[in-house]
């Protein structure tokens, strides 16, 4: 959401979020690291092209033209500098001048050594308990952001992992239309449209970098879960990894796993949508997970087949009109899982990414809650690996990523909601090893084992 330094009355009233980097001569003397040439404070550029007609409530949602409702000036960093105050490097770069290229490798969770597995689980648990060092979350919409007295900004600290959950919730929440009116639900800034893959790519990148900083470990990388096994069991659901099934309640995680102690955020949907509040940092009930347990829906009791990945990677066009969850012959809609693996749209189908979520049959299967189950991370790194392989095979052909008339939030140049500093879909539509500093060690069905460089 927003840097802690900008969650104050003055910044909100001025609409300026250009925090100091090293203000040696007092506050406001080094916005965006300008004194050392790292960046400068400039006007925000937000996409103003038309979106599709799915969303008829222009003017009612804080996420429109993100982030202009909140801030119209922010840091623009030079060269490879990055971050809310240009104090870090762009992904894939390091060093005092951000001119040293680096590459981290995302590997299959099952291929990690016992020590690496343990380190990953402990790191996730640490992220759940560690206050995010930079960002705070809004707990009220913009019109109520200064509190009942107009003088108390409604922001809260939140943990690194819960921030990851909150950003996802904020991107999918309904549009509040007013007290007594039903909130509008046919809006989603991160799913059912071309931005699905780019949005989730940045989402993972943010978490990965937050965890690198938290651990002081630049090589830390998020592993993936190859969910395309065709099996009816969750092979990462063991107590040394993501937690086995509890013997006492088949919908809970075993008490032998640290994840049984996790409590979810953003579960009070009814309250948010009727009162117009936002999810806050308050934790609620436990993670629910019942892999293959949806007996009423046999189609989601088995994970995708390996050949489903092979087939979806043969869909050459990134996206097709209407750029929605009913697009056919669209790679994005296929990997998202609204089309059959061949690319053909079928309203009855749930495949690949969607099928993996639904297979989990619990917290991980509910869009507004799904990141609360840390399997979400692994599921999405694998989805991102498929995306990166598509980008590699088809030379990152962005021509069918629409500049306009996509669902709101999904135009090519839209700033992805609610990421900060503003970042467009285009910026994530690049091959990861060359441009984002990470690669996947992965074997695609029928191919040799490679690191995707």
């Amino acid at each position: 959401q927003f840097p802690r330094e900008c969650a104050n009355i003055e910044a909100l009233r001025r609409g300026v979020c250009c925090p100091d980097l090293l203000p040696s001569s007092g506050p406001g003397t080094d916005p965006c690291g300008s004194s050392s040439g790292r960046g400068r404070c400039v006007a925000v550029i937000a996409d103003s092209r038309p979106h599709s007609r799915h969303y008829p409530h222009d003017g009612k949602d804080d996420r429109e033209a993100w982030p202009l409702r909140f801030f119209n000036r922010t840091c623009q960093c030079n060269d490879n500098f990055s971050g809310h105050n240009c104090g870090t490097c762009r992904p894939g770069w390091r060093g005092a001048a951000c001119n040293q290229k680096i590459l981290t490798v995302r590997r299959n969770l099952l291929d990690l050594s016992p020590e690496e597995k343990s380190h990953f689980v402990r790191a996730l648990d640490m992220a759940k308990r560690t206050t995010h060092p930079q960002f705070v979350i809004a707990t009220r919409r913009l019109e109520d952001i200064l509190g009942p007295d107009g003088n108390t900004p409604q922001f809260e600290n939140i943990s690194v992992y819960n921030y990851f959950v909150w950003t996802h919730y904020y991107s999918v929440k309904k549009t509040f239309l007013g007290t007594g009116q039903e909130s509008f639900g046919d809006v989603d800034f991160s799913h059912e449209g071309p931005a699905f893959l780019t949005w989730h790519r940045y989402h993972l990148l943010q978490l990965e970098r937050d965890m690198q900083e938290m651990l002081q470990e630049p090589s830390f990388s998020l592993p993936y879960w190859n969910f395309a096994t065709g099996k009816n069991v969750c092979d990462v659901c063991t107590d040394d990894l993501m937690g086995s099934r509890s013997n006492f309640d088949s919908t809970l995680i075993s008490p032998n796993s640290v994840f049984s102690q996790w409590r979810v955020v953003c579960e009070s949907l009814e309250e948010y949508d009727t009162l117009g509040t936002l999810c806050n940092s308050t934790e609620g009930g436990p993670i629910r997970r019942n892999p293959a347990g949806n007996v009423g829906r046999p189609a989601v009791q088995r994970l995708p087949e390996p050949q489903d990945v092979t087939q979806c990677l043969e869909v050459r066009v990134f996206d097709t009109p209407p750029f929605y969850s009913n697009s056919t012959d669209s790679f994005r809609n296929t990997v998202e899982g609204y089309s059959a693996p061949t690319g053909k749209y079928d309203p009855a189908v749930r495949s690949l990414h969607n099928l993996a979520h639904l297979f989990l049959n619990g917290t991980g299967g509910q869009t507004h809650l799904s990141p609360n189950d840390p399997i979400f991370v692994l599921l999405h790194t694998f989805t991102d690996a498929v995306f990166d392989e598509w980008l590699r095979r088809y030379n990152a052909d962005i021509s069918t990523f629409p500049l306009e008339n996509a669902p709101i939030g999904h135009n090519r140049q839209y700033n992805m909601v609610p990421f900060w500093p503003p970042v467009t879909n285009t910026e994530m539509f690049v091959t990861a090893p060359d441009n984002l500093g990470y690669a996947y060690e992965v074997q695609w069905p029928g191919q040799e084992f490679t690191v995707s460089e």
């Epitope: 104090g87 390091r94 060093g95 005092a96 040293q100 680096i102 590459l103 380190h119 640490m126 308990r129 560690t130 206050t131 900083e213 938290m214 651990l215 002081q216 470990e217 630049p218 090589s219 830390f220």
Partner: antibody, heavy 121, light 107 residues
Framework: EVQLQQSGAELVRPGALVKLSCKTS????????LHWVRQRPDQGLEWIGW????????VYDPKFQGTASLTADTSSNTVYLQLSGLTSEDTAVYFC??????????????WGQGASVIVSS | DIQMSQSPASLSASVGETVTITCRAS??????LAWYQQKQGKSPHLLVY???TLADGVPSRFSGSGSGTQYSLKISSLQTEDSGNYYC?????????FGSGTKLEIK
């Protein structure tokens, strides 16, 4: 002036535990990660782990997991290393040291004078 | 874990000479490397960070270089006060291991 002042030498029995302190001055420990390093007699340096005093997070080298425990008291700008189940192999000088992570600076830039621990019956 | 192989284990040189100590990492550590000097009975002292940046107050006769898995510390115009043990340490991945050390003796 940045300083890390460590507690004095300790003579302890095998199986016992010892708690070493490192009082810092000249900087706020909440802004740094504090690391601990071991050096056995006539041997090299071994990294034990770090603590982030701002939130209490700790990370250890797996070989010290379970025997070393790092804590911090931000009100007195002091960090502690507790070692349990001591054996003669733990006879060593223990150093506290700090790392600035603001720019991912790869270095431990200031060190305490070291605290000698002798494990003997 | 990244292993750091340091060589030589010891060396002897005369005042005014140039010596080079090397550290080889078992994987690419992307310049996340520091060099320290430790004199007998004293604490280690930072010489170089980020593989090639000299720490404050360190004489310019010390220099760090390298990339990927191979790094070196060069000391030119040796002085008598340069005797002691030298260690490298990486900060790429946990745990942040040290090299085994090099004992430098001034003849």
């Amino acid at each position: 002036e940045v300083q890390l002042q460590q507690s004095g030498a300790e003579l302890v029995r095998p199986g016992a535990l010892v708690k070493l302190s490192c009082k810092t001055s000249g900087f706020n420990i909440k802004d740094y990660f504090l690391h601990w390093v071991r050096q056995r007699p006539d041997q090299g340096l071994e990294w034990i782990g770090w603590i982030n005093p701002d939130n209490g997070n700790t990370v250890y080298d797996p070989k010290f997991q379970g025997t070393a425990s790092l804590t911090a008291d931000t009100s007195s700008n002091t960090v502690y290393l507790q070692l349990s189940g001591l054996t003669s192999e733990d006879t060593a000088v223990y150093f506290c040291t700090r790392r600035d992570y603001t720019y991912e600076k790869a270095a431990l830039d200031y060190w305490g004078q070291g605290a000698s621990v002798i494990v003997s019956s | 874990d990244i292993q750091m192989s340091q060589s030589p284990a010891s060396l002897s040189a005369s005042v005014g000479e140039t010596v080079t100590i090397t550290c080889r990492a078992s994987g690419n550590i992307y310049n996340y490397l520091a060099w320290y000097q430790q004199k007998q009975g004293k604490s280690p002292h930072l010489l170089v960070y980020d593989a090639k940046t000299l720490a404050d107050g360190v004489p310019s006769r010390f220099s760090g270089s390298g990339s990927g898995t191979q790094y070196s510390l060069k000391i030119s115009s040796l002085q008598t006060e340069d005797s002691g043990n030298y260690y490298c340490q990486h900060f790429w991945s946990l745990p942040f291991t040290f090299g085994s050390g090099t004992k430098l003796e001034i003849k």
